[in-house]
Interface confidence: low
């Protein structure tokens, strides 16, 4: 998957006071970013 800028996606989607740096340190790929935010928002 993928497409677009994952950095832009992260900056527009930050929740729970997490920082861009901390998220990038725990997610290894663009696909991880996609799934992380999908599940985060989907389980609200």
């Amino acid at each position: 998957g993928g497409g677009g800028s994952k950095h832009k996606c992260v900056q527009n989607s930050l929740v729970n006071n997490e920082t861009l740096e901390s998220i990038m340190n725990t997610l290894e790929s663009e696909e991880d970013f996609r799934k992380y935010f999908y599940y985060l928002e989907g389980s609200k």
């Epitope: 497409g3 996606c9 527009n12 799934k35 935010f37 999908y38 599940y39 989907g42």
Partner: antibody, heavy 122, light 113 residues
């Protein structure tokens, strides 16, 4: 009423163009990722393209990349699929489909349009 | 791309009996970070669009009868109709949404024996 109303199908010659529309109602359209899924006559389902709620992110199947363009107008609650350089193998019923979560990323589909038939033939 | 393979292609079951459809993915659709399987099941009746039955491999969509259940993890999944009803005659599809391009199984046609 929560629904997706499709329009824009029809008969087109190979190499031609067509634009499909999908008008959404009953939910906050801009909150949801949307996809197009097609089904050739008598065949199974094939995901074609997807777009995030904001329209910032788009995704395509290899079979249509470079020929089809997905877009949305959130002010009109409408999803589009611009189809260029059409081929006989693009003949199918095209469905628009909504993702069930308020997410920027598409995944699975809880609301479907009724479908519109696109026939590519000379 | 992740290939999805369903078995059998068609299935004839007596009313009130159990129907079991299998779906196998060419690679795991289990995402370890959240322990979720990115797999959905749909029902499609003739002349109608598909209808979502199951997502996250085992979560039943609202309004779907409880005779429909999903199970499995990783690469092997099952849709079970515990007691087949006449209105369940349809084609059933699995779909992975682990990664784009999202892919569907070829479909399993369920009929009454």
């Amino acid at each position: 009423q929560v629904q997706l109303v499709q329009s824009g199908g029809g008969l087109v010659q190979p190499g031609g163009s067509l634009r499909l529309s999908c008008a959404a109602s009953g939910f906050t359209f801009s909150n949801y990722a949307m996809s197009w899924v097609r089904q050739a006559p008598g065949k199974g389902l094939e995901w074609v393209s997807a777009i995030s709620g904001s329209g910032d992110n788009t995704y395509y199947a290899d079979s249509v990349r470079g020929r089809f363009t997905i877009s949305r107008d959130n002010s009109k609650n409408t999803l589009y699929l611009q189809m260029n350089s059409l081929r006989a193998e693009d003949t199918a019923i095209y469905y628009c489909a909504k993702d069930p979560h308020s997410s920027r990323w598409p995944g699975f589909f809880d609301l479907w349009g009724r479908g519109t038939l696109v026939t590519v033939s000379s | 791309d992740i290939q999805m393979t369903q078995s059998p292609d068609s299935l004839a079951v007596s009313l009130g009996e159990r129907a079991t459809i299998n779906c196998k993915s060419s690679q795991s659709v289990l995402y370890s970070s959240n322990n979720q399987n990115y797999l959905a099941w749909y029902q499609q009746k003739p002349g109608q669009p598909p209808k979502l039955l199951i997502y996250w491999a085992s979560t039943r969509e609202s309004g779907v009868p409880d005779r429909f259940s999903g199970s499995g993890s990783g690469t092997d999944f099952t849709l079970t109709i515990s007691s087949l009803q006449a209105e369940d005659v349809a084609v059933y599809y699995c779909q992975q949404y682990y990664s784009t391009p999202y892919t569907f199984g070829q479909g399993t046609k369920v009929e009454i024996k």
